[in-house]
Amino acid sequence: ATKLTEEKYELKEGQTLDVKCDYTLEKFASSQKAWQIIRDGEMPKTLACTERPSKNSHPVQVGRIILEDYHDHGLLRVRMVNLQVEDSGLYQCVIYQPPKEPHMLFDRIRLVVTKGFSGTPGSNENSTQNVYKIPPTTTKALCPLYTSPRTVTQAPPKSTADVSTPDSEINLTNVTDIIRVPVFN
């Protein structure tokens, strides 16, 4: 079985998680992409997704999550602003490719959010000031309900991240739940 690697980010409340998911330009530039959370023993939940087809450099904001798909870079940028302790968890980027199952982009992100802002005097990002300035054209895309008939795969435990490296592609088989969060205006 393929082992999944994780990259860990330990941030303080109010800070921003800012990660980029690399994908194959030729195959996936216009494909719909999503940001998911994987809770212990549960199926991945889609928190936000790009439009279908995915638009270049067009921010999509769902609550405190902002997705931007840069076709020219082959990167999906994911930002979670004003982090809260309860945002802690395991996250991943996936690409929807119906009728096939979603394609996972490595590596997963283990986010740990702790109390107390990690600022320094003069810092210009704090819990009430760090929400990204998103263009007024920001939209919320509808995420497909992506269900597989296969057996649910158990999510990895919250223990230390496995440092071994994946050697083959992984297709998700257990995406069934969609979280819908109001858009910030």
């Epitope: 330990e10 941030l11 303080k12 990660v19 870079h73 992100i109 210009n124």
Partner: antibody
Framework: EVQLLESGGGMVQPGGSLRLSCAVS????????MSWVRQAPGKGLEWVSE????????YYADSVKGRFTISRDNSKNTLYLQMNSLRVEDTAIYYC????????????WGQGTLVTVSS | EIVMTQSPATLSVSPGERATLSCRAS??????LAWYQQKPGQAPRLLIY???TRATGIPARFSGSGSGTEFTLTISSLQSEDFAVYYC??????????FGQGTKVEIK
């Protein structure tokens, strides 16, 4: 164990060319972005070039744009830096570095190879 | 291009003392900042990323803080092996990825 081993450095005259190689092992090379970072003698670190993993996108510092070309051979687990029209100010130790999957920060570095450009 | 400025250029500290290194970005990089340690004749080593996350195998005496434009690397009790040059690097937005000019931590 992750390993990166640079080679190809040496002495060259201004205007000359060199090709650096970085052989890697211990991780799935094709998945990760890789960068070249250099350090002039007694100076600080300067990012030179990056090549993404899945997308293959390439980026260059302004100081080398049009003269250097980054490439990779995923079947050989090797990263390259073709350096043309070399200048005296290109003299440095050149490191190849593996990046995080999720951001351009460098979690593994090679030992470096010295490039000396002198007449 | 985002310019990273480190201070002081040199920090003289006695073993066992606390060392505080600063890094300032010319514009906000949020938490997209890393710290590296480099000893003479060696390649840099990743210490901290995401402004505050310790890299694998890095001792707890190293801690990072800050966000936006102001960042700090703290070494709580300097050990002999900690005397080295430290660099900050921003990885916000797109290349070029830029480093600070470095802070040399030397024995007082």
């Amino acid at each position: 164990e992750v390993q990166l081993l640079e080679s190809g450095g040496g002495m060259v005259q201004p205007g000359g060319s060199l090709r650096l190689s970085c052989a890697v092992s211990g991780f799935t090379f094709s998945r990760y972005a890789m960068s070249w970072v250099r350090q002039a003698p007694g100076k600080g670190l300067e990012w030179v070039s990056e090549m993404r993993g899945s997308s293959g996108s390439t980026y260059y510092a302004d100081s080398v744009k049009g003269r250097f070309t980054i490439s990779r051979d995923n079947s050989k687990n090797t990263l390259y830096l073709q350096m043309n029209s070399l200048r005296v100010e290109d003299t440095a130790i050149y490191y190849c570095a593996k990046e995080f999957s999720s951001n351009s920060l460098f979690d593994y570095w090679g030992q470096g190879t010295l490039v000396t450009v002198s007449s | 291009e985002i310019v990273m400025t480190q201070s002081p250029a040199t920090l003289s500290v006695s073993p066992g003392e606390r060392a505080t290194l600063s890094c300032r970005a010319s514009q906000s990089v949020n938490s997209n900042l890393a710290w590296y340690q480099q000893k003479p004749g060696q390649a840099p080593r990743l210490l901290i990323y995401g402004a505050s996350t310790r890299a694998t195998g890095i001792p707890a005496r190293f801690s990072g803080s800050g966000s936006g434009t102001e960042f700090t690397l703290t070494i709580s009790s300097l050990q002999s092996e900690d005397f080295a040059v430290y660099y900050c690097q921003q990885f916000y937005n797109w290349p070029p990825w830029t480093f600070g000019q470095g802070t040399k931590v030397e024995i007082k």
